[in-house]
Interface confidence: low
Amino acid sequence: QEFLLRVEPQNPVLSAGGSLFVNCSTDCPSSEKIALETSLSKELVASGMGWAAFNLSNVTGNSRILCSVYCNGSQITGSSNITVYGLPERVELAPLPPWQPVGQNFTLRCQVEGGSPRTSLTVVLLRWEEELSRQPAVEEPAEVTATVLASRDDHGAPFSCRTELDMQPQGLGLFVNTSAPRQLRTFVLPVTPPRLVAPRFLEVETSWPVDCTLDGLFPASEAQVYLALGDQMLNATVMNHGDTLTATATATARADQEGAREIVCNVTLGGERREARENLTVFSFLGPIVNLSEPTAHEGSTVTVSCMAGARVQVTLDGVPAAAPGQTAQLQLNATESDDGRSFFCSATLEVDGEFLHRNSSVQLRVLYGPKIDRATCPQHLKWKDKTRHVLQCQARGNPYPELRCLKEGSSREVPVGIPFFVNVTHNGTYQCQASSSRGKYTLVVVMDIEAFSSH
C-alpha cells in the first residue's frame, strides 16, 4: 500500500516578511519523525503520531518547502510552493522637461523599485487618467518609458506612473501604487522675430512709444519680454490677446545716449528667445534761438538780430545762412518806422542719418516813433450834405499808438473819428485833428463844408 505525506497549506501566497503556519501529516501507521526542509527560519510548534506543525517566520522571498518522513523504511515526501508578494518601495516618474515644445516628442520615464512577484507587476504611464503605456515590470529597478508627442492640450496636464500588482488569481485583489504626478508645460514659440515698431530718430529728452508684437505664441501669458534702448531697460506694459503678445513702452533718450543706438525687444518662452533689433539715432537739436539786441528800439538806433542753434545745425536768418553749421547767423539794421512789427525768421536744419530735420523760430521788433496822421487817409476838405450819415476816415500811427481827436476851432465840439455820425449844418467849420502819444503830437487841419438841405 502507498502512503501519502500532505503539506498544508498548498501553494500559499503571503505578504513579504510575513509568517506561515505549515502542517505536515501522513496516513502511514508506522511513521518516524516528520522533517521540514526549508531555507527559511522555522520552528516546530507541535507534533504527534503522523503529523507535525511548523511556524515559518520572516518569509521574504518565494520558496519551496519539503516535508519528508520514513514509512516502513521508505522515504515519502510532500511539497508546497510559497509565493511572496510585496508592494513596490518606490514608484517615481522622472522629472519632465521644464518646457516642452509643441509638436516634439518627449519621453516619460518611470522607475519602480521593489514589488513582487514581478510576473504579476505591471507599470502604467498615464496622462490625466488616460493610459499611454502598459508594460510589465522586468528589471530591478524596473524602468518603463513611453514616447509622447507634445500638444497644446498637454500644457498643465498631470502625468503619473501607476503600478498594479495583480494578486486577484490568488484571491487577494489588485494592489495599486501611484507616483506623485508631474505637470507638463508645453509651449509654441514661432521662428519669426517679433515685430518692433520704433522711431528712426529720437531727440534727447523727448519720449516716443515703442511697440513689440509677436504672434503665434503659446501660452502668451508665460512669455517674458525685455525692451531696451541701448543698455537702458524700458518699463514695458505687456498685453496678451489670444496667441498674440504686445509690449508697449515709452522710450525717452538721455543726453548721454546721443548717437547711433539700438532698440532691442527680446521675447523669451520655454527657455528659448526671439529677438528684434531696430537702429535708432538719438540726436540733440537745440534751437533755433533768435535774439534782438534791443527788442524795443528807438527810431534811428542800430539793432542786431542773431540766430543760433546747437552744434552741427545750419541756421538761416531772413534768407541769410550762417557761415557754417554750428555758427550764428546775424544781421544789423537802422530801426525805422517801417521796421515796427517786423518779424525776423530763422530756420534751422540738422542732418541726422541722411535725413534733414527742420525747425523754425521768429522774433518781432518794436520800433518807437512819434505820432503821424496819414494825409492819404485823412481828406483835408470834406463836402457833405446836411442831414446825411458820414464817417470821418482819419488814421493815426505811431508807437506807442497815439490817441486821435478832431476838435472844431474856437469851440470844444469834437467829431467822432472812424465812426458813422449824422452831419448837420452845425458841423460846418475848420477842425484840428491831433494825434498824441508819449512821443509827441501831430496836428492836421480838416475843413468840413456842410451844404444846407434844399427843401424844393
Epitope: 518606490r90 522622472a94 522629472p95 520615464r109 522607475q111 529597478p141
Partner: antibody, heavy 119, light 112 residues
C-alpha cells in the same frame, strides 16, 4: 574596486564659474547616484545636490539653486559640478560621492578638489 | 531643513578608552517607507570622509566591529568600544531622509 577621481585644484576670480569633474570606475555608473558635498576651510560638510545618471535627473539644495548645475556623461562615466557667480565664501574643498539607492548613504568619496576664489 | 546637532564638539580620549558621540535631529528621520536614513562618517586628517555606519546601525564593509550605531526617531549615538590611533579624526552624522541632506557640525576625536 570603486574609485571616484576628481579634477585638480582651481583658482578663480569673484564672479567667474568653475566646473569640477568626477570620473567613476569599478562599478556601473548608471546604477548609483552621484552627490556633491563641499567643505569650507576648517568647517563642516555641506550637501549641494545630486544626479541620477540613469535618469539624468537632478536635485539641488535650495541654497545653491540657480548657481549650481550638476551633469553626467554616461559615455565617459563622468559627473560634473559647475558653480557660477563665485564669491570668496565659495572657497572650499568640493567632494563628489556616490550612493546606491539602498543603503541611502554615501559609500565612496572622491579625493576632493580645492577651489580658491580670490581677486 | 533637518538640523543635525552633534555633541560633544571635541572628545579627548586615551587609546583603549570607550567613546560615545551623540547626534540629535530637529525632525524625525523615519522615512515614509519605514527606514531611518541616519549615517555616520569619519574624516581623518587630510582625507575625504569615509562611511562607517549606514541606516542607524549597519556597519559598512570593512568597518571594525568596535564601531556601533544606535537610536531612533530624532536621537542617535555612535559608540567606539576601544579607541585606536587610526580612529582619530572628525566624526559627522548625516541624514538622507529629507532633502536637502544635512550633516552634523562634527565631533573631533583626539588624544588626551
Amino acid at each position: 574596486q570603486v574609485q571616484l577621481v576628481q579634477s585638480g585644484a582651481e583658482v578663480k576670480k569673484p564672479g567667474a564659474s568653475v566646473k569640477v569633474s568626477c570620473k567613476a570606475s569599478g562599478y556601473t555608473f548608471t546604477d548609483c547616484i552621484i552627490l556633491w558635498v563641499r567643505q569650507a576651510p576648517g568647517q563642516g560638510l555641506e550637501w549641494m545636490g545630486k544626479i541620477n545618471p540613469y535618469f539624468g535627473t537632478t536635485t539641488y539644495a535650495q541654497k545653491f539653486q540657480g548657481r549650481v548645475t550638476i551633469t553626467a556623461d554616461t559615455s565617459t562615466s563622468t559627473a560634473y559640478m559647475e558653480l557660477s557667480s563665485l564669491r570668496s565664501e565659495d572657497t572650499a574643498v568640493y567632494y563628489c560621492a556616490r550612493k546606491e539607492a539602498y543603503p541611502d548613504a554615501m559609500d565612496y568619496w572622491g579625493q576632493g578638489t580645492l577651489v580658491t576664489v580670490s581677486s | 531643513d533637518a538640523v543635525m546637532t552633534q555633541t560633544p564638539l571635541s572628545l579627548p580620549v586615551s587609546l583603549g578608552d570607550q567613546a560615545s558621540i551623540s547626534c540629535r535631529s530637529s525632525q524625525s528621520l523615519v522615512h515614509s517607507n519605514g527606514d531611518t536614513y541616519l549615517h555616520w562618517y569619519l574624516q581623518k586628517p587630510g582625507q575625504s570622509p569615509q562611511l562607517l555606519i549606514y541606516k542607524v546601525s549597519n556597519r559598512f564593509s570593512g568597518v571594525p566591529d568596535r564601531f556601533s550605531g544606535s537610536g531612533s526617531g530624532t536621537d542617535f549615538t555612535l559608540k567606539l568600544s576601544r579607541v585606536e590611533a587610526e580612529d582619530l579624526g572628525v566624526y559627522f552624522c548625516s541624514q538622507s531622509t529629507h532633502v536637502p541632506y544635512t550633516f552634523g557640525g562634527g565631533t573631533k576625536l583626539e588624544i588626551k
